[in-house]
Amino acid sequence: EEELQVIQPEKSVSVAAGDSATLNCTVSSLIPVGPIQWFRGAGPGRELIYNLKEGHFPRVTPVSDPTKRNNMDFSIRISNITPADAGTYYCVKFRKGSPDVELKSGAGTELSVRAK
């Protein structure tokens, strides 16, 4: 049995330009200790979308449902979506360290943007 699961329930999300997109992510355990970060794209060229501890992400808001008993919710909402936001978004769990070590990624959610 896996010690940690990172679950992105939606494979894809379609949003009209100008609207907000909610990207869902739940994690089965806080252990191992370490942060959750969101990225667009995979590999070395991926773009950091949200990191709770550092950086300025004015269009991104955490929208967790803290009532979830069996999982930790680390979902985000991106406001004022534009075509440039299209791509696949990954919720990634890190293990705390110096530096933090990437541990597990969700399967990804593809965001497509429709014309208004």
């Epitope: 010690e3 355990s29 252990i31 803290p66």
Partner: antibody, heavy 118, light 112 residues
């Protein structure tokens, strides 16, 4: 019904060792993060150690790091705390605690008393 | 370490009245909208029992006269109305990413 039954407490001299055990039943032990929390009249509740569901990751506060070792046997539904180089300040009631998500301490055993004294 | 200051240390409240306990953390225990502060009840001779998880969520089987609120550094446990069986010591506990996890010093609730 969740049951956590601790054993192995007792009187030990400073510098000595003890091994605490916790027998779990009533839930899927291998899916739960497990911890030990201790309680002293003077210091209240103090987190002692935590282990991930599969046993890969362990965490300790500085007060016990290097002296205490937490392990688990999921096949036996058992949790173990090996305590070495015991000090008077380790005297406490030790509780075995289960946690579904590693966040809150969901279920507590009745505790076992450890006394470190010469 | 995140230090949790719990107040008051003891509290005497009349039956049927409201009891309010506060915990203040030395730094935020929030992450992604989750507040990693929890509340426990301990009666004499018994282990602690989880009442409220993540600041405001009532654990299954806990009466709804117990409620929790707060975020970031300031949290409150409210018992309303207080009943005789609520006489106990109450503890808060933070489980943020910042180790070690720590507890408040406890609040002993008695009947006035």
């Amino acid at each position: 019904e969740v049951q956590l039954v601790e054993s192995g407490g007792g009187l030990v001299k400073p510098g000595g060792s003890l091994r605490l055990s916790c027998a779990a039943s009533g839930f899927t032990f291998s899916s739960y993060v497990m911890s030990w929390v201790r309680q002293t009249p003077g210091k209240g509740l103090e987190w002692v150690a935590t282990i991930s569901s599969g046993g890969t990751y362990t965490y300790y506060p500085n007060s016990v790091k290097g002296r205490f070792t937490l392990s688990r046997d999921n096949a036996k539904n058992s949790l173990y705390l090996q305590m070495n180089s015991l000090r008077a300040e380790d005297t406490a009631v030790y509780y075995c605690v289960s946690s579904m998500t590693g966040s809150s301490f969901d279920y507590w055993g009745q505790g076992t008393t450890v006394t470190v004294s010469s | 370490d995140i230090v949790i200051t719990q107040s008051p240390a003891s509290l005497a409240v009349s039956l049927g009245e409201r009891a309010t306990i506060s915990c203040r953390a030395s730094e935020s225990v929030d992450s992604y909208g989750n507040s990693f502060m929890h509340w426990y009840q301990q009666k004499p001779g018994q282990p602690p029992k989880l009442l409220i998880y993540r600041a405001s969520n009532l654990e299954s089987g806990v009466p709804d006269r117990f409620s929790g609120s707060g975020s970031r550094t300031d949290f409150t446990l409210t018992i309303n109305p207080l009943q005789a069986e609520d006489v106990a010591t109450y503890y808060c506990h933070q489980s943020s990413e910042q180790l070690p996890w720590t507890f408040g010093g406890g609040t002993k609730v008695e009947i006035k």
